[in-house]
Amino acid sequence: QPDAINAPVTCCYNFTNRKISVQRLASYRRITSSKCPKEAVIFKTIVAKEICADPKQKWVQDSMDHLDKQTQTPKT
């Protein structure tokens, strides 16, 4: 079993300064660890490139909304 206590933490130290088209994005994950200096989003593109982005920016929030809705599979 992996040792979760000593698992490496991924952090973002710089954010992209260009808006990425949602058509290029495949997924995202949030960096919420208190061990990281910045609250961040890591987008994964359709060519598997990972890009750090600032969750305070509206285009980042809109892109997360877009990707969330793509996962929508009603189970109710």
Epitope: Y28, R30, K69, P74
Partner: nanobody, 123 residues
Framework: EVQLVESGGGLVQAGGSLRLSCAAS????????MGWFRQAPEKEREFVAV????????FYSNSVKGRFTISRDNAKNTVYLQMNSLKPEDTAVYYC????????????????WGQGTQVTVSS
């Protein structure tokens, strides 16, 4: 960290209304998808409603669709659940949650949870 505090629960008669509020503090509220879930005694926690970061998209469980309305005010860091035409089967503890990871209605994609507020609907 995001701290979530629910309020507005209580005892109401069947057919009545309640408005739940969830006040968030901590990190950037507008960067989180917000959801409401509920848990009745002896039952598993179930999804109720979700609203996107922009507030432009919402989704409801079939059991509350047409009766409940989720909304948010990003300026006030608050999400609401307006509950109308309440039924005894709506009795539960209602939880507000902030979704950090990619998803929609799945509880596992919500990183932050409030302590819950009790809603009791009497017949």
């Amino acid at each position: 960290e995001v701290q979530l505090v629910e309020s507005g629960g209580g005892l109401v008669q069947a057919g009545g209304s309640l408005r739940l509020s969830c006040a968030a503090s901590g990190r950037t509220f507008s960067s989180y998808r917000m959801g409401w879930f509920r848990q009745a005694p002896e039952k598993e926690r179930e999804f109720v409603a979700v609203i996107s970061r922009s507030g432009g998209s919402t989704f409801y469980s079939n059991s509350v669709k047409g009766r409940f309305t989720i909304s948010r005010d990003n300026a006030k860091n608050t999400v609401y659940l307006q509950m109308n035409s309440l039924k005894p089967e709506d009795t539960a503890v209602y939880y507000c949650a902030a979704g950090a990871q990619m998803g929609w209605a799945e509880a596992s994609t919500y990183d932050y949870w409030g302590q819950g507020t009790q809603v009791t609907v009497s017949s």
